[in-house]
Structure formats: C-alpha cells, structure tokens
C-alpha cells in the first residue's frame, strides 16, 4: 500500500502503478474507488467522474493511470483502490490492483488573541480566533488550569472546503493580573495561545 500525505487545498497524485497503451484502452476497464465508492471509471475509452470529484479530478492515463485530485478536502482522506480489467477471450479479467492511502492534513494555525476596552467599566474583552483546520474544533479558556466561561464561542464550517473557523470572547476584570490560555482541540491535536495582562504597567503581551 502506497501512502500519500498532503495538506488541505493542495494537489494529490495517486498512482495506479500500471501503464496501458492507447491501443489497449479499447479493451480495458479502469476503476478508481474510494472505500467502495466509485471515483472514476474508464471503460473502453469512455471516462466518467463521479459528482463529488467532478471539476477537481484529472485522470492522467499517460502517468501510470494516476488520478490527480485538486483542492484537497478533508473528506478526500482514505484508501483508494485502482482496478484494471483487461479483456481476455470472452471476459474482462483483473490485470492489476493497487491501493493508495491518502492522508489530508488540515492544521489550525496558532490562534490570535486581540483585546479591546469596554468603555466606562473595568472590564476588558479578548477575542481568540483561528481558521482553516479540520476536524471540528473545541475551544476553551483556561486560567491557572481552571476552565473559564466564555461569553460566546462560534464554530463555522465552509461547505466548499469543509474547513472550520472558531472564535470566542472572554471578558475579564482589568484591575487584576491575568494569564489566560486559549486552547483549541481538534481530533488528537491542539493549538493554543496565551494572553497576559499586567495591571501595574497596564499592558498585555501574548506568548509566541
């Protein structure tokens, strides 16, 4: 099994590892499937691409019957199977079988924290946000290891790219020192950013 790892939105080339001459195409059926669902077929020279892959998949017949998937999505991750059937006597016989595992990475960048003052009060508001990752993120605010209540946390997903964006607000009393951590967990991964507030100097600085 061949393993291919790519970043989301990148291009992945999955090779069948087999060549068929132009003359042989008329007597050949080629199936690309992903986890038992069809991606692409070429039957005696007629090509068909399934709707989920249309307009973003190229079949490169001259390059080992590879499929090239453009603008990778998280849902493209999985095991692809290429089957080549060759007409022999009175039937199509399996001539070649190959498996390619595609991993699609979609890491959230380190979140950014912005802050602003709420007029005529001792309350300051900070906003933590990041976008462009997968799977669905879970954001929490921590201070000294204790979880805090955010004002509101919004998670949205782009239907086209399948990538998530997350944003969360936290209000705090600016008359005391604070060190807040914005922690984002997604799948088995996590990213975080720390916001420090120092009352004596009336300043903040994020950890990098």
């Amino acid at each position: 099994v061949i393993h291919v790892t790519k970043e989301v939105k990148e291009v992945a080339t999955l090779s069948c590892g087999h060549n068929v001459s132009v003359e042989e195409l008329a007597q050949t059926r080629i199936y690309w499937q992903k986890e038992k669902k069809m991606v692409l077929t070429m039957m005696s020279g007629d090509m068909n691409i399934w709707p989920e892959y249309k307009n973003r998949t190229i079949f490169d017949i001259t390059n080992n019957l590879s499929i090239v998937i453009l603008a990778l999505r998280p849902s493209d991750e999985g095991t692809y199977e290429c089957v080549v059937l060759k007409y022999e006597k009175d039937a199509f016989k399996r001539e070649h079988l190959a498996e390619v595992t595609l991993s699609v990475k979609a890491d959230f960048p380190t979140p950014s924290i912005s802050d602003f003052e709420i007029p005529t009060s001792n309350i300051r508001r900070i906003i933590c946000s990041t976008s462009g990752g997968f799977p669905e993120p879970h954001l929490s605010w921590l201070e000294n290891g204790e979880e805090l209540n955010a004002i509101n946390t919004t998670v949205s997903q782009d239907p086209e790219t399948e990538l998530y964006a997350v944003s969360s607000k936290l209000d705090f009393n600016m008359t005391t020192n604070h060190s807040f951590m914005c922690l984002i967990k997604y799948g088995h991964l996590r990213v975080n950013q720390t916001f420090n507030w120092n009352t004596t100097k009336q300043e903040h600085f994020p950890d990098n």
Epitope: A26, Q33, S44, N48, R94
Partner: antibody, heavy 116, light 108 residues
Framework: EVHLQQSGAELVRPGALVKLSCKPS????????MHWVKQRPEQGLEWIGW????????LYDPKFQGKASITADTSSNTAYLQLSSLTSEDTAVYYC?????????WGQGTPVTVSA | EIVLTQSPALMAASPGEKVTITCSVS???????LHWYQQKSETSPKPWIY???NLASGVPVRFSGSGSGTSYSLTISSMEAEDAATYYC?????????FGAGTKLELK
Amino acid sequence: EVHLQQSGAELVRPGALVKLSCKPSGFNIKDYYMHWVKQRPEQGLEWIGWIDPENGNTLYDPKFQGKASITADTSSNTAYLQLSSLTSEDTAVYYCAREGLFFAYWGQGTPVTVSA
Amino acid sequence: EIVLTQSPALMAASPGEKVTITCSVSSSISSSNLHWYQQKSETSPKPWIYGTSNLASGVPVRFSGSGSGTSYSLTISSMEAEDAATYYCQQWSSYPLTFGAGTKLELK
C-alpha cells in the same frame, strides 16, 4: 461450458426480505464481476449492480441503494442478491449475468412475487 | 445517468421486409460500448449485437448494427418469423449501466 443456475421462484409478503442465488458452472466467480438485472412484468431491463467477488467491492445503481445487497461466497462459487422491505414494486424477474464486453451469459431468472 | 431512447416502441413487419430499430443515447459514447439484446417472452435476454456492429455467436447474418456518438441502429435486412421478439439496446460507457425501454417487433 458456461452456465448460470439461479434459485427458484419466490412468493413473499410485503415488508419481508428475500435472498436469491446464482451458481455458475464452467468458471470461478472470483475471476469475474457478477451483475444483477431486474425486469418487472411487461417492462424493460434495469441494472441493479455488480460485485467483485474477490474483494467484495460492490457498485449499485443509486435507485437500488438500500433496497438491494449483492454478496458472493467464493468457497461455494455463488453470488447472491438480497432484497429488503419488499413492496409490489419489487415483483419482477431477477437475472444474474457475468461481466464481459457485454452480458454474454445470463441466468434463467428468478421470479419474485410480492403479495399479501 | 445515460438515457437510451429506443424507437419505435412497437412495430410489426411482414416476412421479407427490412426492419430498422434506433437507439438514441443522451450523451456521446464510444461505439464499442453499445450493445443489443434479443428477448422472447418468458426467457432470458440473449446477446445479439455487441460493440455496435459485431454479431454475437449464432446470430443470423441478416442482422446488422451501425452508429456512432449518440445515434445507433439495429437492422434486419429481411424479416423472418423467428425474429419476432423484443430488442433492447444497452450502454457500457458509464455507471449506472442502462438499457433502452425496448422495441417489440411483431410479425405481420
């Protein structure tokens, strides 16, 4: 000589399920994709789907997804078609056929009648 | 999916008459992927013409097939009684595989 022997006629109640068999002679099913085709009374032919018996991969016409399930047992050299939640619309003759450039070999067909 | 439209749906021909059945395909396909089957009542379909113009084993030479792209036809040069049957065209260009609705040919 290639021959596809299908199981006998079935009379089944609405809502039930039925499993039809297709046992070839003259070839080993693991070397060929096996297809199923439906023909309702006085109607045309409808392709249901295929199975690659070697690895169990299947492909269905979307309109039969959830209704039909194609399986194969290479040890007994038999392909199966299971139909679930039967209604009068499923009353038909079901054929198995072997993949080729075209359907060169067909079973004799299994009539399925859905009736209360 | 690719839709195959056969015409006529029903026709009758006298012995010795020339018969043509057409099959119109909703999108262009390779001629090697268009096939014809003959079916008589209460029997399984039989392969009749494959790859547009090749006669299946045992098919009389009075039958012929032609066409390309989206337009295909089956022709009987001289109708005989045993030709009375239903004829179906079928495409193997893309999934789902599809058949025409059939042309019932009767003897006049």
